[in-house]
């Protein structure tokens, strides 16, 4: 197994609808054909898995049906979108990339993207 560099933005602000998108780019040393991408959330020194997908190069990323993540791939870039975020979900989201095939196995872990989520203010009642 070998190490690999993974780049991702330092900070992303989620939309008012609780959607955050960022690009995860990995420095593939060769022509990988099977890639696994995992998003991890680190908060208070606890690391939890948010979502994961294995994809064959050239195909779409397929997350589980109940996943809060969607994504597309283009070359060595993965465009990730996380939905349904609330203020309590603010934290560091780490992109992990594994090159599963062909050998050797490579693992790359990004430095993380700090995603800030601000719950929208409720609309004030308006009198007409």
């Amino acid at each position: 197994c070998k190490a690999m560099h993974v780049a991702q933005p330092a900070v992303v602000l989620a939309s008012s609808r609780g959607i955050a998108s960022f690009v995860c780019e990995y420095a593939s040393p060769g022509k990988a054909t099977e890639v696994r991408v995992t998003v991890l959330r680190q908060a208070d020194s606890q690391v939890t898995e948010v979502c994961a997908a294995t994809y064959m190069m050239g195909n779409e990323l397929t997350f589980l049906d109940d996943s809060i993540c969607t994504g597309t791939s283009s070359g060595n870039q993965v465009n990730l979108t996380i939905q349904g975020l609330r203020a309590m979900d603010t934290g560091l989201y780490i992109c992990k990339v594994e090159l599963m095939y062909p050998p050797p196995y490579y693992l790359g872990i990004g430095n993380g993207t700090q995603i800030y989520v601000i719950d929208p203010e409720p609309c004030p009642d308006s009198d007409f």
Epitope: C1, E34, L40, V47, T54, E98, M100, Y105, L107
Partner: nanobody, 119 residues
């Protein structure tokens, strides 16, 4: 806790066949590369074959065309079908799982099963 348990080893004559099976416990099977390695007396452990979660396979040159690896996600098993066995295939065969757990690379090994090819 992850455990890999092998079965199916034994004594077989040259030209014969054996099927090794490895059962994985723990939540790793769908995420890890599963493989078989072997170690003959006085030699280093070497890769025989492995299979990715997506079903891509990789074989050592010495077993290509004779051995076949497969995985069953429903049963959490990985099998190695060994045909046209030769005396030089004699070794202890180990099941292996390679992948990552959160931020760490992990590799797990079974206890091994003896395969002896002799007349």
């Amino acid at each position: 806790e992850v455990q890999l348990v092998e079965s199916g080893g034994g004594l077989v004559q040259p030209g014969g066949s054996l099927r090794l099976s490895c059962t994985a416990s723990g939540n790793i099977f769908s995420r890890y590369i599963m493989g078989w390695y072997r170690q003959a007396p006085g030699k280093q452990r070497e890769l025989v074959a492995d299979i990715t979660p997506g079903g891509n396979t990789n074989y050592a040159d010495s077993v290509k065309g004779r051995f076949s690896i497969s995985r069953d996600g429903a049963k959490n098993t990985v099998d190695l079908q060994m045909n046209s066995l030769r005396p030089e295939d004699t070794a202890v065969y180990y099941c292996n799982a390679l992948g990552s757990d959160k931020l760490l690379i992990r590799t797990y090994w079974g206890q091994g099963t003896q395969v002896t090819v002799s007349s």
